[in-house]
């Protein structure tokens, strides 16, 4: 939709005759008609199919045309159209006389005509006037005109709708092509979106006003980066929503136990960190290099039994060194000069031969472990049964014997609620009176576990001397790249170099 | 025992500027949002302001924006509204309650209750 | 914002029956809603949140159910201390809002 405009500006008839060449009487009382029409390559008379205007009379003669845009739009004459603007058109522009008031066709005499002009060709949308002047023998006509779309319509042929608005269903103006300007603080295709405050946490925040950041449930702070502790809690805070992780002193599964322990006695040594894991119990964490239930005791780097096969530990200054027994050699005599030949499996252990003969492997039987069957199997050393269950062996299998209200193969099952195993990838469960609440783990959130969270797997700084320490984003396990020298999953072990 | 105790009934006039104080025991304060809830005579509960306990973050209900203030002080463990320019639409049981606007309040003080007429 | 509608304004209900309250939330809460009981002269407590949990030391014959726009509390044997006025909100959309309340007498 738009409009062709067309501006007169002067007419000349010095010698005041019609297009006959008979004089006008007084004078040529001179008014105009304008057809417009599609572009034809000869001008011919028929259907105005843009449309035609007229205007009163406008002078006698000779006479130049005002601007006059307030009495009803007569100068620049405007010829709307709704439709798409093709680009071309003709135009037919007719001087008439007058010789009374009445300006219809029907009641003018056919040789009323003072002049006719008629020009087509090529014209784009745009502000621009063109200006052209007309001559024939007796008369002249100067003139300009342009298109331009109309209000809310854009674009190269004002088929573009666009109205500005600043509502619930968008908040943008007109860009001169028709496309959204989106307006400070909106974004999105119809500028509905807001611009949340800067830093506002994508997940858990939201806004529906620019520079506003409101958060989902479970999340506090001008960021929504901060969690909210469980309903019950107490005395705790929380890393995820809804937890309930205890203040220093607290206990309970809502933090109520006054656990004051490690507060009033202070009995972990050495540095370590006191944590109270009960009414009037504690746990010791120590400092590398510390054991015992208080960190009393300093770790001698031989306690982890590093050396294999029987090997003896050493303990040096810089760390230790194992003496291999007869047939074995390496680090920590995990190699084997022996072959089947030396019967080195014990127990019962059947050897099978590896590497042509060159190495050998232990096939050892139910009970027995270790790279010649060396070892009983205390199935229990790794006391797998929680909540207090008791561990007992069975031959080449162990068994849990649960305490009331508990149940499973390690008792790790509460008999009510966490009967169902509300909780997901690996979540704790707890009873409580009303209900029941999960306890992630690492990487893991809500109220039931299901939200994956990245976690830093290398915040505990796992891998040693001095190792490189990389997170698998995948797997939120980490890797550790060894120095020069050091080998083993967290580079724990060095390596005897030439 | 969680209690929250908000300071003695008031009458003030309209126009005039009031302040609560909510004393917080029983939990450590400073680790949970607070908020105030009011109740008109005879009508339902409408959420004021909150609090967020990480960085005093605050938010207001439309009608009070500009003329009430949620602040706290940790170390007393006290939650405080401010409020100015009162109106008698203001005439309500005001509670001091813990959560945020995103949480139920799961603690509510016994409220105090305030009257704004001339 | 979103209105919070409660049905009915009153009910009542004989000693030992089931009571059931509705609540209906103007969009989807999800399961972003908490009931709370305000006996007379007292302040409101919280009954239920995320819809289902029951508050700390809440009597089991209180009980909720529901999600998205619809949600109800169930009383299922009145005791004469439920005598009370039982208001739901939502906190799932700021600001949050409360139904009207429903009160619950004897029959």
């Known amino acids: 939709s738009g409009v062709f405009q067309l501006q007169l500006q002067e007419f000349i008839n010095e010698r005041g005759v019609l297009a006959s060449g008979r004089p006008c009487e007084p004078g040529c009382r001179t008014f105009f008609r304008v057809c417009l029409k599609h572009f034809q390559a000869v001008v011919s008379p028929g259907p105005c199919t843009f449309g035609t205007v007229s205007t009163p009379v406008l002078g006698t003669n000779s006479f130049a045309v005002r601007d006059d845009s307030s009495g009803g739009g007569r100068n620049p004459l405007q010829l709307p159209f709704n439709f798409t603007w093709p680009g071309t058109f003709s135009l037919i522009i007719e001087a008439w006389h007058a010789p009374g008031d009445d300006l219809r066709p029907e009641a003018l005499p056919p040789d009323a005509l003072i002049s006719k002009i008629a020009i087509q060709g090529s014209l784009a949308v745009g502000q621009n006037w063109l200006l052209d002047e007309q001559t024939s023998t007796l008369t002249r006509l100067r003139y300009s005109y342009r298109v331009i779309c109309s209000d809310n319509y854009y674009g190269d042929n004002c088929s573009r709708l666009c109205k500005k608005r600043n509502d619930h269903f968008g908040h943008y103006v007109c860009q001169p092509d028709g496309n959204l300007s989106c307006l400070p603080g909106w974004t999105g295709e119809y500028c509905q979106q807001p611009i949340c405050l800067s830093g506002c946490h994508e997940q858990n925040g939201y806004c529906s006003k620019p520079a506003e950041c409101l958060c989902r449930p479970g999340w506090q702070g001008r960021l929504c980066n901060e969690c909210i502790p469980h309903n019950g809690c107490r005395h705790g805070t929380c890393s995820t929503p809804w937890q309930c992780t205890c203040d220093e002193g607290w206990g309970g599964l809502f933090c109520d136990q006054d656990l004051n322990y490690c507060t009033h006695h202070s009995p972990c040594k050495n540095g370590a960190t006191c944590s109270n894991s009960g009414q009037r119990s504690y746990t010791c964490t120590c400092r590398p290099g510390y054991t015992g239930v208080d960190c009393e005791l300093e770790l001698s780097e031989c306690d982890s039994n590093p050396c294999r096969n029987g090997g003896s530990c050493k303990d040096q200054e810089d760390g230790y060194h194992c003496l291999c027994p007869p047939g074995y050699y390496g680090l920590h005599c995990e190699h084997s000069t022996l072959s089947c030949a030396d019967s080195p499996c014990f127990n019962g252990g059947s050897c099978r031969e590896r590497n042509q003969g060159a190495n050998y492997a232990c096939e050892c039987p139910p009970n027995f472990t270790g790279s010649n069957c060396e070892k009983k199997v205390d199935r229990c050393t790794s006391n797998p049964c929680a909540n207090g269950g008791q561990c007992l062996n069975r031959g080449p299998s162990r068994m849990c014997r649960c305490r009331p209200g508990f149940t499973g193969t390690y008792c790790e099952l509460h008999v009510s609620d966490c009967a169902r195993n509300p909780c997901a990838h690996g979540g704790t469960c707890h009873d409580l009176e009303n209900g029941l609440m999960c306890t992630c783990p690492a990487g893991f959130s809500g109220r039931r576990c299901e939200v994956r969270t990245s976690i830093d797997a290398c915040a505990s700084s796992p891998c040693f001397n001095r190792a490189t320490c990389y997170t698998d984003l995948s797997t939120d396990t980490f890797v550790c790249n060894c120095p020069y020298g050091f080998v083993g999953s967290r580079c724990e072990f060095p390596v005897g170099l030439p | 025992e969680v209690t929250l105790r908000e300071s003695g009934p008031a009458l003030v006039k309209p126009t005039q500027t009031l302040t609560l104080t909510c004393t917080a025991s029983?939990?450590?304060?400073?680790?949970?949002?607070m908020a105030w809830v009011r109740q008109p005579p005879g009508k339902g509960l409408e959420w004021v302001a909150t609090?967020?306990?990480?960085?005093?973050?605050?938010y207001y209900r439309d009608s009070v924006k500009g003329r009430f203030t949620i602040s706290r002080d940790n170390s007393k463990n006290q939650l405080v509204l401010t409020m100015t320019n009162m109106d008698p639409v203001d005439t309500a049981t005001y509670y001091c309650?813990?959560?945020?606007?995103?949480?139920?309040?799961?603690?509510w003080g016994q409220g105090t209750t305030v009257t704004v007429s001339s | 914002d979103i209105v919070m509608t409660q049905s009915p304004d009153s009910l009542a209900v004989s000693l030992g029956e089931r009571a059931t309250i509705n609540c209906r939330a103007s969009?989807?809460?999800?399961?972003?809603l908490a009931w709370y009981q305000q006996k007379p002269g007292q302040a409101p407590k919280l009954l239920i949140y995320?819809?289902?949990n029951l508050a700390d030391g809440v009597p089991d014959r209180f009980s909720g159910s529901g999600s998205g726009t619809d949600f109800t509390l169930t009383i299922s044997s009145l005791q004469a201390e439920d005598v009370a006025v039982y208001y739901c909100q939502q906190y799932n959309n700021y600001p949050p809002t409360f139904g009207g309340g429903t009160k619950v007498e004897i029959k």
């Open positions: 969009e989807d809460i999800y399961s972003n």
């Open positions: 995320d819809t289902n």
């Open positions: 029983g939990f450590t304060f400073s680790n949970f949002p």
């Open positions: 609090i967020s306990s990480s960085d005093g973050t605050t």
């Open positions: 309650a813990r959560g945020y606007y995103n949480s139920p309040f799961a603690y």
